[in-house]
């Protein structure tokens, strides 16, 4: 990485500089680079069973530098470490290993999940969702009058999505079948999604109950719930002639 | 579990000497620079001096330089600093540390005060 | 030599607050930075080196950030146990510099 990796030809004392090569201040045969020019950093280099001496302007992969009043000295870090800060905090670990807390893993310790991308150990992030919206006005093929049996839905909105460990979110959407009194539509009305009709809300003895938006909703059975929501809707049908009533169901 | 333990700590008289040991354990120490580091009363952290790993150098801070001197013995796992000409404004709380471009392990502290 | 100016020198918060150091540095440092803490009668504790990086042990609440000269230690909701003094220190070349301290009280 940047080197100018000064070697001598001729042989001379190592304490001898005329004659080094590239950014070297004294550098022998046997031992290539002693020291360096300003700014330089020094490193040592294996080469077989032999430590060379280099100089260079920033330390190569895997080393880290200290500017020392005399010397600007390449270190070492640790074998599985690319980056280092010293010798005890990594920064950047080699292939195949995740970074964690300035060490190099095999694997990432329990309770966290490696990044692939970024090689580190990170925090498993679960889904977190919103509290349910308002449901919306009781319809039945987009219109809010003309008929009796409709639908109303609710959503929630993500608010952090799941990391490749986390918890999935739940669903988002929910539908429910609701009742609203027989009217016919005025002229215009048709079609017309209407958020001025109140919804009465349902008793006691109603189910509030839903589930996720699902295509089996029609074609589910009647539970014992339900039946007891019909009996009660024929008894206050006479008295609440006037109010649409929102009536939850369980499939 | 790295330990660094200081002792030699005590009252001097301004212009005596006095000799601080540091004994470390827990970690390679003769991979290590060592430094001191010191803490006037009520005041903030400074630098005093650096031994780097095999004792060939040392760096001191320009408030002590010519008076203090720095070795180690890797040996035995020591930090030594002999303080000589010591002046008042050498009172501290001196703390021994392994120094790799930051202090990462730091020793309890010795109290140094001078005064006549 | 390097110098280091630390802001402020003294803080008052209460816990739950969000809290922030600043520490100017007089040349470019790259990310050659430290954070330490300091209890009364203890000796300091490495907090974050590499200007960011949580060392060991630390809470998450703490982080730092910056680079080259200005740098931050923020703590986002102080707990009891971070009321101390905090120090920042240039690693970048010798002679290693301090900053003078902050010492955050209880409001």
């Known amino acids: 990485q940047n080197a100018s990796r000064g070697r001598r030809q001729r042989r001379m004392h190592p304490n001898v500089s005329q004659g080094c090569q590239g950014g070297c201040a004294t550098c022998s045969d046997y031992n290539g680079c002693l020291s360096c020019k300003p700014r330089l950093f020094f490193a040592l280099e294996r080469i077989g069973m032999k430590q060379i001496g280099v100089c260079l302007s920033s330390c190569p992969s895997g080393y880290y530098g200290t500017r020392y009043p005399d010397i600007n000295k390449c270190t070492k870090c640790k074998a599985d470490c690319d980056t280092c800060f010293n010798k005890n905090f990594c920064t950047k670990c080699k292939s195949g290993f995740y970074l964690h807390l300035g060490k190099c893993l095999d694997n990432c310790p329990e309770g966290l999940e490696a990044n692939n991308h970024t090689m580190e150990c990170v925090s498993i992030v679960h889904c977190e969702v919103s509290e349910w919206n308002p449901w919306s006005p009781c319809t039945k093929k987009g219109k809010t009058c003309g008929f009796k049996r409709g639908t109303e839905t609710r959503v929630r909105e993500i608010i952090q999505h799941p990391s490749a460990k986390g918890n999935l979110c739940p669903p988002t959407n929910e539908t429910r079948k609701c009742t609203v009194q027989r009217k016919k539509c005025q002229k215009g009305e048709r079609g017309k999604k209407g958020r001025e009709r109140k919804r009465k809300k349902p008793n006691k003895g109603e189910s509030k109950e839903a589930i996720p938006d699902s295509k089996s909703l029609e074609s589910s059975k009647e539970i014992p719930e339900q039946r007891e929501n019909k009996q009660q809707q024929k008894k206050r049908k006479v008295q609440d002639k006037q109010k649409s009533v929102s009536v939850s169901t369980v499939h | 579990e790295v330990q660094l333990v200081e002792s030699g700590g005590g009252v001097v008289q301004p212009g005596r000497s006095l000799r601080l040991s540091c004994a470390a354990s827990?970690?390679?120490?003769?991979?290590?620079?060592m430094a001191w580091v010191r803490q006037a009363p009520g005041k903030g952290l400074e630098w005093v001096a650096t031994?780097?790993?095999?004792?060939?150098?040392?760096y001191f801070g320009d408030s002590v330089r010519g008076r203090f001197t720095v070795s180690r013995d890797n040996s035995k796992n020591t930090l030594y600093l002999q303080m000589n000409s010591l002046r008042a404004e050498d009172t501290a709380v001196y703390y021994c540390?392994?120094?790799?471009?930051?202090?990462?392990?730091w020793g309890q502290g010795t109290m140094v005060t001078v005064s006549s | 030599d390097i110098q280091m100016t630390q802001s402020p020198s003294s803080l008052s918060a209460s816990v739950g607050d969000r809290v922030t150091i600043t520490c100017l540095v007089s040349?470019?440092?790259?990310?050659?930075f430290v954070w330490y803490q300091q209890k009364p009668g203890k000796s300091p504790k490495l907090l974050i080196y590499a200007a960011s990086r949580l060392q060991d042990g630390v809470p998450s609440r703490f982080s730092g950030s910056g680079s080259g000269t200005d740098f931050t230690l923020t703590i986002s909701s102080l707990q009891p146990e971070d009321f101390a003094t905090y120090y920042c220190?240039?690693?970048?070349?010798?002679?290693?510099?301090f900053g003078q301290g902050t010492k955050l009280e209880i409001k």
């Open positions: 827990g970690f390679t120490f003769s991979d290590y620079d």
């Open positions: 540390t392994a120094h790799d471009r930051s202090f990462d392990y």
């Open positions: 040349e470019d440092i790259s990310n050659d």
């Open positions: 220190q240039q690693s970048y070349k010798y002679p290693p510099t």
């Open positions: 031994i780097i790993y095999d004792g060939s150098r040392a």
